[in-house]
Interface confidence: medium
């Protein structure tokens, strides 16, 4: 089964040029780069066009970089977590705690 998660990790000081409503509530500074997106809730693409993208893993949307990635289950790797890794690979990225 494919799990979906939105990552709202913003950089941890206020140098970003824009903020959207799905970032943590914190004091906001900085210009808006000519585009007013502050009150526009951004749709999580993991719930839409990337819903079935990650084969053996979890879709993650990194909002502050507007990037989608797959967090693979143990033993799997690749863009869509579709490739089975050999034993030597299982040590790599085996935990998100690193």
């Amino acid at each position: 089964s494919v799990r979906v998660e939105q990552v709202v990790k913003p950089p941890q000081n206020k140098t970003e040029s824009e903020n959207t409503s799905d970032k943590p509530k914190r004091k906001k500074k900085g210009g808006k780069n000519g585009k007013n997106r502050r009150n526009r809730k951004k749709k999580n693409p993991c719930n839409a066009e990337f819903q079935n993208f990650c084969i053996h893993g979890e879709c993650k949307y990194i909002e502050h970089l507007e990037a989608v990635t797959c967090k693979c289950q143990q033993e799997y790797f690749g863009e869509r977590c579709g490739e089975k890794s050999m034993k030597t690979h299982s040590m790599i990225d085996s935990s998100l705690s690193k």
Partner: antibody
Framework: EVQLVESGGGLVKPGGSLRLSCAAS????????MSWVRQAPEKGLEWVST????????YYPDSVKGRFTISRDNAKNSLYLQMNSLRAEDTAVYYC?????????????????WGQGTTVTVSS | DVVMTQSPLSLPVTLGDPASISCRSS???????????LHWYQQRPGQSPKLLIY???NRFDGVPDRFSGSGSGTDFTLKISRVEAEDVGVYYC?????????FGQGTKLEIK
Amino acid sequence: EVQLVESGGGLVKPGGSLRLSCAASGFTFSSYPMSWVRQAPEKGLEWVSTISTGGTYTYYPDSVKGRFTISRDNAKNSLYLQMNSLRAEDTAVYYCARQGPILRKNYYYGMDVWGQGTTVTVSS
Amino acid sequence: DVVMTQSPLSLPVTLGDPASISCRSSQSLVDGQDGTYLHWYQQRPGQSPKLLIYKVSNRFDGVPDRFSGSGSGTDFTLKISRVEAEDVGVYYCSQSTHVPYTFGQGTKLEIK
């Protein structure tokens, strides 16, 4: 082959402007955040700017904020850095770099592909 | 800003010997949600930097297993188990937990 090629560097007087370009090939450019990093002569690396995949979010250190503007054209697979009000201390090799996390099983925000760099010299 | 301090700044090593580079950050690099965004880059003479280790201990594609990274919080280490001639260059630690992203001053590894 995944490749980044910078251009646009040169000699400019203090207070002048320059626009750097970075042509990307061999990967889906629109899926990756991109960054500029510079290296002054005989010095270390200094991060200059990052832009999100769609260009919505841009980030700068205080040293260039208000003077430099990062932008991208995903249709042209190109990254840009507009540099205004240039100072002698902006003299450096400017590298274009692809930023993770895509294609990893443990995303990391690191810079995994770098161009060869373009040299900017600010001098009167 | 997060200050990254590397030591030593110069590291003369005999071929085949181990080498170790320390990197200390002025504040914790632990991101509460997802991990620790501390990376190591290698810059060989006359070349662009290359990603070596990402997120503390993960070797990037094609990086030999003689390179390893460790550490947590504010203290991190890059180790080379047996230095080879091609390892000569400058090594930088870098953090991308906090904006602005910052790099260490660099450690120049040279062969004795």
